[in-house]
């Protein structure tokens, strides 16, 4: 069974998938469609790297631009380095500026909804 066939079989169960499952899926050439991606749990999407999202979505990654103001894409963008977002070639804006240090302060982030940044 190839990645696409596997994805079709599990598609209906993906809404509640944890980050670990999404990371594993990204290694299986599944090309998740954007509608499915938009239904994923925000907290499961946030830890994914730009490279992992690119692998997870395949050609569907081109659709991120039209969804950049909507959850979970908007919140995911805020967690990524702008340099990494730029590699997607879509002009996505709102990432962490180059030269900033990201502090993973879970309590602060839970309260504000955004990561804590220390400037250069």
């Amino acid at each position: 069974m190839n990645g696409s066939e596997y994805f079709v079989k599990i598609q209906s169960f993906l809404g509640g998938a944890p980050t670990e499952d999404l990371k594993a899926l990204s290694q299986q050439n599944v090309s998740m469609d954007l509608a499915t991606f938009m239904k994923l749990r925000t907290d499961a999407v946030l830890p994914l790297t730009v490279a992992e999202v690119q692998k997870l979505l395949g050609p569907h990654v081109e659709g991120l631009k039209a969804e950049e103001r909507h959850r979970p894409v908007r919140d995911w963008i805020l967690r990524q380095r702008q340099d990494d977002l730029d590699t997607l070639g879509l002009g996505l804006q709102g990432g962490i500026p180059n030269g900033y240090l990201v502090l993973d302060l879970s309590m602060q982030e839970a309260l504000s909804g955004t990561p804590c940044l220390l400037g250069p």
Partner: antibody, heavy 121, light 107 residues
Framework: EVQLVQSGAEVKKPGASVKVSCKAS????????MHWVRQAPGQGLEWMGN????????YYNERFRSRVTMTVDKSTSTAYMELSSLRSEDTAVYYC??????????????WGQGTTVTVSS | DIQMTQSPSSLSASVGDRVTITCKAS??????IAWYQQKPGKAPKLLIH???ELQPGVPSRFSGSGSGTDFTFTISSLQPEDIATYYC?????????FGGGTKVEIK
Amino acid sequence: EVQLVQSGAEVKKPGASVKVSCKASGYTFTNYWMHWVRQAPGQGLEWMGNINPSNGGPYYNERFRSRVTMTVDKSTSTAYMELSSLRSEDTAVYYCARPYYGSSYGYFDYWGQGTTVTVSS
Amino acid sequence: DIQMTQSPSSLSASVGDRVTITCKASQDINKYIAWYQQKPGKAPKLLIHYTSELQPGVPSRFSGSGSGTDFTFTISSLQPEDIATYYCLQYANPLRTFGGGTKVEIK
């Protein structure tokens, strides 16, 4: 003003390869993927694939996957489409096209002027 | 891949006539369809996107409607300069597909 300027017409022999260029100006080249569409004489439009100009990652229409190579040169804001093992059925006008990402995966709002490729022995 | 079936493949109408072209998608594409006009020797020109949104500068005699799988493109009053081939494009999938085209001629 957005412009996509393509290379000139080509005449090739069967079995040869052709490389068509598309020079972009008037916008940030790395913010929009570049697509390629072809049109055989008297026929409709056929999507061939696209390329992410920022990292050079292409996605191809399955029909062309074994013969097409899409590349970019960021320094000159130019996209390239190379088609190998040419046959007479590849005689067509080849267009580059830029999408507008207003909704979903984006529709094409700017097109190159087209490059005519003739395959003949 | 999503197939786009466009009809008719050609039509002949008089100046002032109402002209209708249809595109049927092989699966639900919401409203993600665009319509293009192509004249001989020229690149396609975008007329309409998102089913019914007219591009700036495009005459109001052009319109579009539909959703899901069935879409219609209409020229309310055909003009001599409308002689061209018209194509639909689905962009609900990253692997874009076009309809087969409709050649519009004047009677």
